[in-house]
Amino acid sequence: KEEQISFRDCAEVFKSGHTTNGIYTLTFPNSTEEIKAYCDMEAGGGGWTIIQRREDGSVDFQRTWKEYKVGFGNPSGEYWLGNEFVSQLTNQQRYVLKIHLKDWEGNEAYSLYEHFYLSSEELNYRIHLKGLTGTAGKISSISQPGNDFSTKDGDNDKCICKCSQMLTGGWWFDACGPSNLNGMYYPQRQNTNKFNGIKWYYWKGSGYSLKATTMMIRPADF
């Protein structure tokens, strides 16, 4: 049997025998277009495609619609994989979304959504989520039902204001809502009482900006 040389996601990479964490080349569904992604092959059974990571403030997340569409940053560090790839991927089959969070006091938590997908660009990459479990709050910090994605140059939120400009970063803003993992990165001892930080309200409450975040997806039937 010929070895598979293109992978749609990190689950396929894992199943092919590559079980080491690292950067792998993935291929868009039904296309030859490629994208580099970080694969977590250890956490919770492995096979996770990392679609977002914040850890040190080294990358500016106040980016344009096009940059959030195609992705930016470095897959080995802080990065955004790209809305177009994630949208195409999550509309091929059912995916789960796991959001892993770290605060500045050494605590960790996660939110796991049993079904996640993004609408197409025509529908502003609207987020769709079902079935929340985890330790980062009993209520979803991503507003339900899901909102359209907004950036500094693409205002699709539900506010008569511009959430992305006010709170910084591209996100599925409501008006403006209880989360923004793409907000300003604030270092320790500067991370409280911030309205534009890295926010996951139903875990850390008002004005707390997190130390590290990872958003990862994997097929539901992995």
């Epitope: 008569i160 006010m166 008006a175 309205f195 926010k199 008002s206 004005g207």
Partner: antibody, heavy 129, light 109 residues
């Protein structure tokens, strides 16, 4: 869908009080300020004040200070406006209207002056002896 | 307190452009919002933050603001645009919202 539904028309005598309700649906009630605006027959719009449903904090227009009380019941997503010591010139349509509080989840402690994007249908209050 | 001045009425023929002004001291330094109110109905937001349109409002409605005058412009006016129009600003010195007196737009038949 997002809507604000107000209580029905009222007829009151001078010196009495009136309490108008405004029930919100289709959005997070605590994430938006609720304003009250009135309009006397054939006249323009007059802002009366706002309440922050999250904290219960209020800001009343100077003209109505001491006569108006704005409250809310978050359990039923309803805001109330009570106007006391009514006079004949209080005869007007009273509207509730919301404006977003984009910092609701961050509580920086200041008011963001966003426009009023959704309005109730209005409540006619007639003050007559 | 801050005062906003609007013309009581503006008339325009169908298909033409209507311009409704809102005057105020250094109003260009403030964000101006505009509301449309048809008889017997509640006001509807048509322009916010000087020139932005809420979803569902036609592109024919636009706004500008500089110096001492803000302007609501309605291009290709239709009979259904006949209504009262109010401008609004937040007066940070008094922490109060202020409305203009309103302008009645008449579409000539």
């Amino acid at each position: 869908q997002v809507q604000l539904v107000q209580s029905g028309a009222e007829v009151k005598k001078p010196g009495a009080s009136v309490k108008v309700s405004c029930k919100a649906s289709g959005y997070t009630f605590t994430g938006y300020y609720m304003h009250w605006v009135r309009q006397a027959p054939g006249q323009g719009l007059e802002w009366m004040g706002w309440i922050n449903p999250n904290s219960g904090g209020t800001n009343y227009a100077q003209k109505f200070q001491g006569r108006v009380t704005m409250t809310r019941d978050t359990s039923i997503s309803t805001a109330y406006m009570e106007l006391s010591r009514l006079r004949s010139d209080d005869t007007a349509v009273y509207y509730c209207a919301r404006s977003p509080n984009p910092y609701y989840y961050d509580s920086p402690g200041y008011y963001y002056p966003a426009a009023f994007d959704i309005w109730g249908q209005g409540t006619m209050v007639t003050v007559s002896s | 307190s801050y005062v906003l001045t609007q013309p009581p009425s503006v008339s325009v023929a169908p298909g033409q452009t209507a311009r409704i002004t809102c005057g105020g001291n250094n109003i260009g330094s403030k964000s101006v919002h505009w509301y449309q109110q048809k008889p017997g109905q509640a006001p509807v937001l048509v322009v916010y933050d000087d020139s932005d349109r809420p979803s569902g409002i036609p592109e024919r409605f636009s706004g500008s603001n500089s110096g001492n005058t803000a302007t609501l412009t309605i291009s290709r006016v239709e009979a259904g645009d006949e209504a009262d129009y109010y401008c609004q600003v937040w007066d940070s010195s008094s922490d109060h919202w202020v409305f203009g007196g309103g302008t009645k737009l008449t579409v000539l038949s």
